[in-house]
């Protein structure tokens, strides 16, 4: 049998080392050796690819070596398959070199700063020394920040000029670090070279990009004055090495400047003592180069009646987030401000907050929120200045069994009755959301019986139980991960009722 | 449509010179690789020389090697071969010729030249 | 440095097929391809085969080239004969030797009435 035509030829020249081509079939049935067949020099020369005996054999590739390897030109290649059977021919296939020079990455020697230029880096390289001189070579700069994953890309040319290289970067982030890699190609080639190694390159600093302002409102105190706790940080968007050196805070109640009072402080947070009117708070960020844009905020009066307009929310996992989606009855609302901190028995101790735009849901990954811990999430509706009444919702991210079971004590004990009452479990341990309780009871070498109960129910009265008889019971609380038991309780039935 | 026409040929004494044209029409000259191919009295085709397509390079059959000299110009779209010493057996019609991949997929008409005393 | 040789004539009848051989000296009749020419009495030769088997377009289909490793040699065939393919062949290759092209000696075809 004739060996199979070669196929699927595919060519390149690397710049000043080879110019190979590849084949298929890669593997033939029989022993099968080949030759390629090149014309070179416009046409004008021939030559076969110089592999020895030993390589030949099955082996889909061949590379014409240098000084044979004129640039510019247009090659014809021929592969030819010979086997014990006889010979096959490809057909003719036609290379124009320029357009599969595959040449050397560049090499980034420096990303830096202009002095006073902001937002910008200037990239300098060195051009390929395994390159054409006279060529235009094509570039593509990729360029990410540091901290994230999804690169960009941009793409010019440059003429041959020096070796030495430099293209100006602009509209990027203040203050921010960039990785950047540097690949190029003749103008004319199909193929790029390889990436350069990574250089990492920081944009120049500048006066705080912006805050994003919030409060959680408490109870008035007995003298009638109402603490609010202000909370300030970066704005979505601002660089991730922007430091302040402090904030000024400055406040007065509505249509009365004269009675601002001001603070400055270096912390994100502060509480403020305010009176029942409506007050105005504005905080400004600063560094050595300037402030940063005014966060205002507007504290309603005591007595003042919030909008309400979120009808329903919803929490769902996916496989790697926790979505919460409401819906609203207002279409003007499309701010919306998500608090969550953990639901603890004591004070929480984080407290997490961040605006939303345009949507009516917010995600977070997993695992930014500890598992096993319930989250308190209330969204407020923002319109402008005003911010409506929240809508609040529970959530975990993972559920696991509760760490305890109920504690449970059996009160009015009768001839064949019990009452079982139990204790909520403490949130710090639930593990999730309690779904039901099971109370299981035994007599003295008797059947085990259940019931479940729904996890409102904190007490259950046991009927049709044996006079005189000992009884053992716990009571099981299960989350959707499973069931933990509580402590096992004795108790014995009368053998006489007070009416008998 | 391709065109080679020759120019220059005639009667020439033993020793002497003689500068033969080819003047090219109907394809872009300077990406062709170029040649002279002579054919004497009832005799074979016998290649004399080649260029590459800037010129940079040429090619001679070892009996013209230090003798003739084949040039372009591009510009003027005109290939050139410069016999000087010529002998009685450069006694040929010169053909101007254009390589395709290995072959000469065009001819000119061919100019005599005539080497005697 | 390899020689083509070629008979010095063939000759065939009006409408039969004929071959004219073209026996490569040394190394491997693969390793370059072969060309046909065709040269009417003072004409210019025109090709007719390329590349050990492609015709131009404007060539009729009776002629065809073909190469033997066994013989190492290549082939110009004609079929159906006719008046008009009276004329000297000449097979022509690459010799990387002399860097530069090899033609045979030509042959001479006559067409018989």
């Known amino acids: 049998v004739l060996p199979a035509k070669p196929e699927n030829i595919s060519c390149i020249f690397y710049y000043e080392e080879n110019f190979t081509c590849t084949w298929s079939p890669e593997k033939e049935a029989s022993y099968t050796w080949y030759k390629v067949k090149r014309t070179y020099s416009y046409g004008y020369k021939s030559d076969i690819c110089s592999t020895d005996n030993s390589t030949r054999g099955n082996h889909a590739s061949c590379s014409f070596l240098p000084p044979t390897i004129t640039n510019p030109d247009n090659y014809t290649i021929q592969v030819e398959a010979q086997n014990a059977d006889g010979i096959m021919k490809s057909d003719i296939t036609y290379w124009n070199l320029d357009a599969i020079m595959k040449i050397e990455p560049p090499e980034i020697f420096s990303v830096k700063s202009v002095l006073g230029i902001k937002r910008m880096l200037q990239i300098k390289w060195i051009r390929p020394v395994l390159a054409p001189h006279s060529s235009t070579l094509k570039y593509t700069l990729r360029f990410r920040t540091i901290n994230s994953a999804y690169w960009m890309e941009v793409n010019f040319t440059k003429e041959d000029i020096d070796r030495d290289e430099t293209y100006n970067l602009t509209e990027l982030q203040a203050f921010t670090e960039y990785v950047m890699t540097l690949r190029c190609a003749p103008a004319e080639s199909m193929f790029w070279s390889g990436w350069s190694q990574e250089k990492v390159g920081t944009t120049e600093e500048e006066a705080p990009y912006g805050l994003d302002l919030w409060r959680v409102l408490k109870p008035a105190m007995v003298d009638g004055r109402r603490p609010v706790q202000l909370m300030w940080k970066k704005a979505t968007g601002a660089p991730v090495l922007e430091k302040a050196l402090g904030y000024n805070i400055w406040y007065f109640p509505e249509n009365n400047t004269n009675l601002t009072e001001t603070v400055n402080t270096t912390n994100q947070t502060h509480e403020l003592y305010l009176g029942g009117k409506t007050y105005w708070v504005y905080v400004v960020s600063y560094n050595s180069l300037g402030e940063s844009p005014v966060a205002t905020l507007r504290i309603p009066a005591l007595n003042e009646k919030t909008f309400q307009c979120i009808e329903a929310m919803q929490a769902c996992l996916t496989q790697d987030q926790l979505v919460v989606e409401w819906q609203s009855s207002a279409p003007e609302v499309d701010t919306w401000m998500v608090e969550w901190f953990p639901d603890v028995d004591s004070e929480p101790s984080s407290f997490s907050w961040e605006s939303v735009s345009q949507a009516r849901n917010w995600t977070i990954q997993k695992d930014e929120l500890k598992p096993l811990w319930c989250y308190n999430i209330s969204v407020y509706p923002v319109l402008r200045d005003r911010v409506g009444q929240p809508y609040s919702t529970q959530a975990y991210v993972q559920e696991g069994i509760p760490s305890a079971g109920p504690v449970t004590q059996a009160d009015s004990i009768g001839v064949k009755t019990v009452t079982i009452t139990w204790k909520e479990i403490p949130k710090s341990k639930r593990n999730g959301f309690i779904k039901n309780y099971t109370i299981f009871y035994q007599a003295e070498d008797g059947k085990e019986f259940s019931k479940t109960v729904n996890s409102n129910i904190l007490q259950y009265r046991l009927e049709s139980l044996t006079r005189r008889t000992s009884y053992s019971l716990q009571v099981m609380a299960s989350t959707n991960a499973g069931g933990t038991n509580g402590t096992k309780i004795n108790f014995k039935t009368l053998s006489i009722s007070v009416l008998e | 449509e391709v065109q080679l026409v020759e120019s220059g040929g005639g009667l020439v004494k033993p020793g002497r010179s003689m500068k033969l044209s080819c003047a090219a029409s109907g394809f872009t000259f300077s990406n062709y690789y170029m040649a002279w191919v002579r054919q004497a009295p009832t005799k074979g085709l016998e290649w004399v020389a080649s260029i590459s397509t800037g010129g940079g390079n040429t090619y001679y059959r070892d009996s013209v090697k230090g003798r003739f000299t084949i040039s372009r110009d591009n510009a003027k779209r005109t290939l050139y071969l410069q016999m000087d010493s010529l002998r009685s057996e450069d006694t040929a019609t010169y053909y101007c010729?254009?390589?395709?991949?290995?072959?000469?997929?065009?001819w000119g008409q061919g100019v005599m030249v005539t080497v005697s005393s | 440095q390899f020689t083509l040789t070629q008979p010095k004539s063939v000759s065939g009848s009006l409408r039969s097929t004929i071959t004219i051989p073209c026996e490569r000296s040394s190394g491997d009749i693969g390793d370059s391809y072969v060309s046909w020419y065709q040269q009417h009495l003072g004409r210019p030769p025109i090709n007719v085969i390329y590349v050990d088997d492609q015709r131009p377009s404007e060539v009729s289909d009776r002629f065809s080239g073909s190469i033997d490793s066994s013989s190492n040699s290549a082939s110009l065939t004609i079929t159906d004969l006719q008046m008009d393919d009276e004329a000297d062949y000449f097979c022509q290759s690459y010799d990387s030797n002399i860097d530069g092209p090899v033609f045979g000696g030509g042959t001479k075809l006559t067409v018989l009435g």
């Open positions: 010729g254009r390589h395709g991949t290995l072959y000469f997929d065009y």
